[in-house]
């Protein structure tokens, strides 16, 4: 019995659903009563899911697996794994026994995009040329371990005096902290790039340091030039700092965070007290850091509706304000591919291939190509619909006339995260039946 699985690992984002494809060729007169199907972990042989005696025996794997019952009779033994976790990563064996039998293993590669790095300086004020500063680049909740690169404003790699640590949390996701020690010149830009090797996703941030003259008491309000990119559901820090004058006390500080366009109050600190969040109770200051001039705002459980510009207004004796942009993003799921019609296909037939990817933000860019990498632009219709949370579901339809055989790939790109999610379908053999990937 020929059991077929994809050669390449199935890449799944943490929290999304993954389909482990497995197909077999049913013999004439085959009935489900004859089918025995076992999915198990390749290494430990732990049972994951099974079908026997004409019945789905259910999930033996945390109730997160399912078969495609309507497709089993056509030879589709694929397994749906829901709410993927880091611990799911590894090899799964699909064992099919009818009269003949066979098995094959498919690899699941789990991934999670890294957040846009935040940059901190120590010391962060009264800097002068010749001072040694420690620049820390931190990026959160990614998988697998990241590759971290530093470079200066001219793009020259900085490799000396770099220490990188990666710690996994209970979910197995990594927080990356990379520390660069440099001696300041007259001024300089330092960039940190955090790469997810599986997703080929690069997240980068930079900091420009202009050494200051002695403080005069003037309030210089500083925010990052680049937008702060935050994943939906995560927390974001809108950085804002000012230079406290000598003898400054928090009793003198008046701090207002508000939406730049509508002037809606978000959070304030005045009369020596944190006045609290005026923005759905999802904001917080860093009270222990205010006295050092850190007026940053923490925005919790980021939503698509939070996207936009936030103004940080500081008034002591002098006053100043600056606006920081929040760019919200959500990774797109690995596309699922469906064919219509999906059986008895012959060269010359016109088929409709649908590529669907879910719950991303902002709107995606969709690209189709053939097995040789040649772009397919004709007869493509793409629609993107936002749900109540503002996340987009993408459906792209390609109409093609079949050749003797062919591979059709769909790539869904998140333009903000620079995250590419792709799916492909190979149509071979005549006549043939396609077991669709769900």
């Amino acid at each position: 019995l020929e059991v077929q699985v994809p050669e390449d690992p199935v890449v799944a984002l943490v929290g999304t659903d993954a389909t482990l494809c497995c197909s077999f060729s049913p013999e004439p007169g085959f009935s489900l009563a004859q089918l025995n199907l076992i999915w198990q972990l390749t290494d430990t042989k732990q049972l994951v899911h099974s079908f026997a005696e004409g019945q789905d025996q259910g999930s033996a794997y945390a109730n997160r697996t399912a078969l495609f019952p309507d497709l089993l009779a056509q030879g589709n033994a694929s397994l749906r794994l829901q709410r993927v976790r880091v611990a799911d990563e590894g090899s799964f064996t699909c064992f099919v026994s009818i009269r003949d039998f066979g098995s094959a293993a498919v690899s699941l590669q789990v991934a999670a995009p890294y957040s846009k790095p935040s940059m901190t300086l120590e010391p962060n004020k009264d800097l002068r040329p010749g001072d040694t500063v420690t620049i820390t680049c931190s990026s959160y909740q990614g998988y697998p371990e990241a590759e971290v690169f530093w470079q200066d404003g001219q793009g020259v790699p900085l490799t000396g005096n770099v220490t990188t640590s990666q710690m996994a949390n209970e979910q197995g996701l990594f927080d990356v902290h990379s520390i660069l020690r440099v001696v300041l010149g007259a001024n300089g830009t330092y960039s940190c790039l955090v790469r997810n090797p599986v997703l080929q996703q690069d997240a980068h941030s930079s900091v420009t340091i202009t050494p200051q003259r002695s403080p005069t008491g003037a309030v210089e309000v500083q925010v990052p030039e680049d937008p702060v990119v935050a994943l939906v559901g995560t927390d974001a820090t809108l950085r804002c700092s000012f230079s406290p004058e000598p003898g400054f006390s928090l009793a003198q500080l008046n701090l207002i965070w508000q939406l730049t366009d509508t002037k809606q109050l978000v959070h304030s600190f005045t009369e020596g007290r944190d006045q609290g969040s005026a923005y759905a109770n999802r904001t917080a200051l860093f009270p222990d850091l205010l006295a050092q001039g850190n007026a940053s705002l923490r925005l919790q459980r980021v939503r698509v509706a939070d996207e936009g510009s936030f103004t940080c207004f500081v008034s002591i004796r002098d006053f100043g304000s600056a606006a920081v942009s929040l760019q919200v993003a959500a990774p797109y799921s690995k596309p699922s591919m469906t064919l219509e019609p999906n059986k008895d296909l012959r060269p010359g037939d016109t088929v409709t291939i649908t590529c669907s990817s879910y719950r991303g933000y902002p709107e995606a860019e969709v690209f189709w190509q053939d097995g040789q990498g040649v772009p397919l632009t004709g007869n493509v219709t793409t629609s993107q619909m936002a749900n109540e949370q503002g996340l987009f579901d993408v459906h792209s339809v390609l109409r093609v006339v079949l050749g003797a055989n062919g591979t059709y790939s769909c790539l869904v790109r998140n333009p903000v995260l620079q995250q590419d999610a792709h799916g492909s379908v190979t149509i071979t053999g005549q006549p043939m039946t396609f077991p669709p990937e769900a």
Epitope: T216, N254, I256, Q258, L265, Q275, S315, R317, F319, G320
Partner: antibody, heavy 118, light 111 residues
Framework: EVQLLESGGGLVQPGGSLRLSCAAS????????MHWVRQAPGKGLEWVSA????????YYADSVKGRFTISRDNSKNTLYLQMNSLRAEDTAVYYC???????????WGQGTLVTVSS | QSVLTQPPSASGTPGQRVTISCSGG????????VNWYQQLPGTAPKLLIY???KRPSGVPDRFSGSKSGTSASLAISGLRSEDEADYYC???????????FGGGTKLTVLG
């Protein structure tokens, strides 16, 4: 002694322009935000515009936005207000004031009169 | 029409205590400190109270300020004839991104 001295007021026709100056002395000018506040004859105080110590941030009342421009020259310890497209309702005594804690204004000039009339 | 509302006038006799109110909203007095100014006839305004209740040096302790919610008040005890002046409250309004004044209260000392 801390002092602010306004100048540049006068009579101007509607639609005309005028530039007010405020010379500061007796304190580190660049360490303080500065304001322009006006008072029409027989009326109350109206805040017009403000500028941060470095000049990097500026603020305007809606009534003058797009017509007035505040600026400062810290090397000359001088604050300016460029007033364009003047209207009769801009007629007032214009005061410059030094920014203070809690959004206050602790030092005021003696004022300069701007009259917009044909 | 001023963002902060003050009574146009108030009066009292020497030695009396008078109070001047200033009413605003959540985006100004409700969330930011209040300052008070005294303007004697023909002169520039002078800072009288800052940060709701603090007196700059040189201001007599007969003048006091307080704030509650979206309102503030200036109290003058032991009224003197030289207190006859216009009094203005002022705050910062976050929804306007600007400083705002009350319309002013003319205080008359009788007798």
């Amino acid at each position: 002694e801390v002092q602010l001295l306004e100048s540049g007021g006068g009579l101007v026709q509607p639609g005309g322009s005028l530039r007010l100056s405020c010379a500061a002395s007796g304190f580190t000018f660049s360490s303080y935000g500065m304001h322009w506040v006006r008072q029409a004859p027989g009326k109350g105080l109206e805040w017009v515009s403000a500028i941060s110590g470095s000049g990097g941030s500026t603020y305007y009342a809606d009534s003058v936005k797009g017509r007035f421009t505040i600026s400062r020259d810290n090397s000359k310890n001088t604050l300016y207000l460029q007033m364009n497209s003047l209207r009769a309702e801009d007629t007032a005594v214009y005061y410059c004031a030094r920014g203070y804690y809690y959004y206050g204004m602790d030092v005021w000039g003696q004022g300069t009169l701007v009259t917009v009339s044909s | 029409q001023s963002v902060l509302t003050q009574p146009p006038s108030a009066s009292g006799t020497p030695g009396q205590r008078v109070t001047i109110s200033c009413s605003g909203g959540s985006s100004n007095i409700g969330s930011n400190p209040v300052n008070w100014y005294q303007q004697l006839p023909g002169t520039a305004p002078k800072l009288l109270i800052y940060g709701n209740n603090k007196r700059p040096s040189g201001v007599p302790d007969r003048f006091s300020g307080s704030k509650s919610g979206t309102s503030a008040s200036l109290a003058i005890s032991g009224l003197r004839s030289e207190d006859e002046a216009d009094y203005y409250c002022q705050s910062y309004d976050s929804s306007l991104s600007g400083w705002v004044f009350g319309g002013g209260t003319k205080l008359t000392v009788l007798g």
